[in-house]
Interface confidence: medium
Amino acid sequence: LVITPPGPEFVLNISSTFVLTCSSSAPVMWEQMSQVPWQEAAMNQDGTFSSVLTLTNVTGGDTGEYFCVYNNSLGPELSERKRIYIFVPDPTMGFLPMDSEDLFIFVTDVTETTIPCRVTDPQLEVTLHEKKVDIPLHVPYDHQRGFIGTFEDKTYICKTTIGDREVDSDTYYVYSLQVSSINVSVNAVQTVVRQGESITIRCIVMGNDVVNFQWTYPRMKSGRLVEPVTDYLFGVPSRIGSILHIPTAELSDSGTYTCNVSVSVNDHGDEKAINVTVIENGYVRLLETLEDVQIAELHRSRTLQVVFEAYPTPSVLWFKDNRTLGDSSAGELVLSTRNVSETRYVSELTLVRVKVSEAGYYTMRAFHADDQVQLSFKLQVNVPVRVLELSESHPANGEQILRCRGRGMPQPNVTWSTCRDLKRCPRKLSPTPLGNSSKEESQLETNVTFWEEDQEYEVVSTLRLRHVDQPLSVRCMLQNSMGRDSQEVTVVPHSLPFKV
């Protein structure tokens, strides 16, 4: 909604003419004091809609708020409106005239209220007085609304000075009403139902004896009324409930069910709403997916969680390599499915102290008569690396051959390193990495095998040292995401008798 000129407040000269335009992407109209003044509404050549309000020969009586609203405002669209305020200073008019019922102000509890005496000129100074005592009260004044504050049960008048004459407003009477605050709660037996099932909604009020229930629900639109049942639940505090029951739900019963509770002695009220969805058939839907490969660490516990939405309650089965799983008596495997909200579920598979044999393909299947869903993943069990052997051999050609064998999951990396100064190795001197050197001093060959039955990799790395001219400390280190392991061996030249 776009208002031109934009405002939000205008001060007009008496007898002048003022044009206000409101434009939007849907038909609009102007409202003043809930009345619709004469205006020109049109669709423009650019496809927008506008309404032009022309105020001619304005007087003090034109002072007030004007709203631009959508002209078929129903339901929540009512709140979508734009306000501007116009002052027309009129020395002949003191306070704006009031309807007699607006002079009686009913207050419940200690709440802020407004004594709505308004003037046509925003420059005027206005004071509030208790009628009996002619002393101004220190209450903030808003020229567009009046005096805003907390008032006792007394009689009040507003005063202002126009030129050299003092002007009094009508008398305002403030009355306090004791009504306990309304506390409404609305709940449904189920907010998701299949067609043919029943809808039951309860609206409960605490601590008030005289209340009026008013329901709005989707069936009202087609003129089919449902008779609610009022239920008195005696006790301390007292509770009154209204129950709306639809025995056989239809798809058109989907929507918002609103319970409006009002107290007849005042305008006190509260409103609560709940959404109900009627579905043709039940459903099961995954809310989160899992990576295709899930990792567990050997001898650690691992919980795998699947979140899904379903109605009605589904059965849940877990499978490993196409065989159904169940809670094990040894407590190595725990299955649980929790209902975390009306239609949301969390199914968990917990593997306690994971074993290598628990690696494999897992599937969770959630199903009922109307629908089913399944989620599969591969469980990989990670095993720390171990160097199983580091051996050396001396073929006749004078080479030294070192063979390092180890296992782990995921696949380990092999690093060979050497250290020549035995006294300072490896604490004080960093080892030198070895590999296939261009000088052909060393040659490295690594073979990897995956052992299906053990679900882990075996690495065999062979290091050929062409000639060794002094004692060397050689280390083979295996490393993967689970950690590292190493072994060392001391290699001596063929010609050198070496004692450790």
Epitope: V2, S24, S25, A26, G47, T48, N72, E77, E80
Partner: nanobody, 118 residues
């Protein structure tokens, strides 16, 4: 961001019919006011028909009774059924979208040519 794609234009004889379609991307289609506009050679672009987010449909007087605009929120689409076409209906027809609460059309299609020969 809304993308609009028109289709259904072409060349027809006076008195024939054509149906234009416009499909929008985006999940909040129902909250937009949608409009059909046209621009004849050498003239300004003018509105033909509008369907608002709160479900008013308004047609320009010159096409009333001959053109019917409709909308299908489930398909994110609007349509313009053009019957009893006249040579003066020859123009590029554009589909446009205006967000709720604004007073302008921020999103436009590329246009589709309609030619009516006598």
């Amino acid at each position: 961001e809304v993308q609009l794609v028109e289709s259904g234009g072409g060349t027809v004889q006076a008195g024939d019919s054509l149906r234009l379609s416009c499909t929008a991307s985006g999940r909040t289609f129902s909250t937009y006011t949608m409009g059909w506009f046209r621009q004849a050679p050498g003239k300004e672009r003018v509105v033909v028909a509008v369907n608002t987010w709160n479900n008013f449909t308004v047609h320009q007087p010159s096409v009333k009774g001959r053109f019917t605009m409709s909308r299908d929120n489930t398909k994110n689409s609007i349509y313009l059924q053009m019957d009893s076409l006249k040579p003066e209906d020859t123009a590029v027809y554009y589909c446009a979208a205006s967000a709720k609460g604004t007073a302008r059309y921020d999103y436009w299609g590329q246009g589709t040519q309609v030619t009516v020969s006598s």
